[in-house]
Amino acid sequence: GSERTCCPVNWVEHERSCYWFSRSGKAWADADNYCRLEDAHLVVVTSWEEQKFVQHHIGPVNTWMGLHDQNGPWKWVDGTDYETGFKNWRPEQPDDWYGHGLGGGEDCAHFTDDGRWNDDVCQRPYRWVCETELDKASQEPPLL
């Protein structure tokens, strides 16, 4: 596999990761697929410092992150442990609210206008952030 040593054009480098900030919205799954096709993933927030960095770039706009509970427990898309990891939920969130009338609960996490997190309907077309780590060997399959 190859290693990414610098960030692609239009991406922002921070603490050995590259970040890309959308300026339009997509449903969570479509945003997730976009990131994957860029050899990245929806942003995984592992520290207060990273939270502040992302918050600074997105401003007061609802923005998807790589956290969901569509299969039961809350999971980060890159496998980072949710239970022991950084969290920044709004008070009384996540609440898996069913009162929105769109069917089902709320299974995808996003940054709210103040940066704290909320769970919401995954189909809402919010902005999103992709992240990829520098110096990480790519997933390119070995040549046979």
Epitope: S24, A29, R36, S138, E140
Partner: antibody
Framework: EVQLLESGGGLVQPGGSLRLSCAAS????????MSWVRQAPGRGLEWVSA????????FYADSVKGRFTISRDNSKNTLYLQMNSLRAEDTAVYYC?????????????????WGQGTLATVSS | DIQMTQSPSSVSASIGDRVTITCRAS??????LAWYQQKPGKAPKLLIY???SLQSGVPSRFSGSGSGTDFTLTISSLQPEDFATYCC?????????FGQGTKVEFN
Amino acid sequence: EVQLLESGGGLVQPGGSLRLSCAASGFTFSSYAMSWVRQAPGRGLEWVSAISGSGGNTFYADSVKGRFTISRDNSKNTLYLQMNSLRAEDTAVYYCAIHGIAVAGTGAHYFDYWGQGTLATVSS
Amino acid sequence: DIQMTQSPSSVSASIGDRVTITCRASQFISSWLAWYQQKPGKAPKLLIYTASSLQSGVPSRFSGSGSGTDFTLTISSLQPEDFATYCCQQANSFPWTFGQGTKVEFN
């Protein structure tokens, strides 16, 4: 200059296999996602499959899932489409296309360069 | 899957005419739409992306508009090299899907 050159098309019987190749030049191949798009005779375009720059993430249309495999060899600047269990309805010109060279960072993957296509005919 | 429906399927026009082609998505796709031009026996060529952004090198007589589900491609003054088939494509979600195409023919 960006160039994409497909090959590997031909006549095959139903149930048979073909392997299409797309040789690329003029850009840093491993940095860009790529797709296969097909066009049946006299019909519209149909997206078939996409692959990320590293080859680590792949996506397929339901019509080919489980039968077709997209892959790439970044050391050879070549994209592949392995087509198995072929059906008459797979008969088409197959184009390889690249995403994001001229149109980067928009939040969507558009097909901004295309090859000239290779014809795969499935018939008994 | 998101269905993309173009109208008309063909249009007859003359040099200098203003030509308008519409594309409707079966679901909301924001502005994640592209327009392509294809000539017989040739590969498609990207004209417009993100509904209204003109691809580099494409003449300014081509323009795109719309968002949500309804989109339009306009050729402000048809030129001889513009006789071709035009199709739209949604890039909102997998599977990416195309319209069936609109053929611009000489009147």
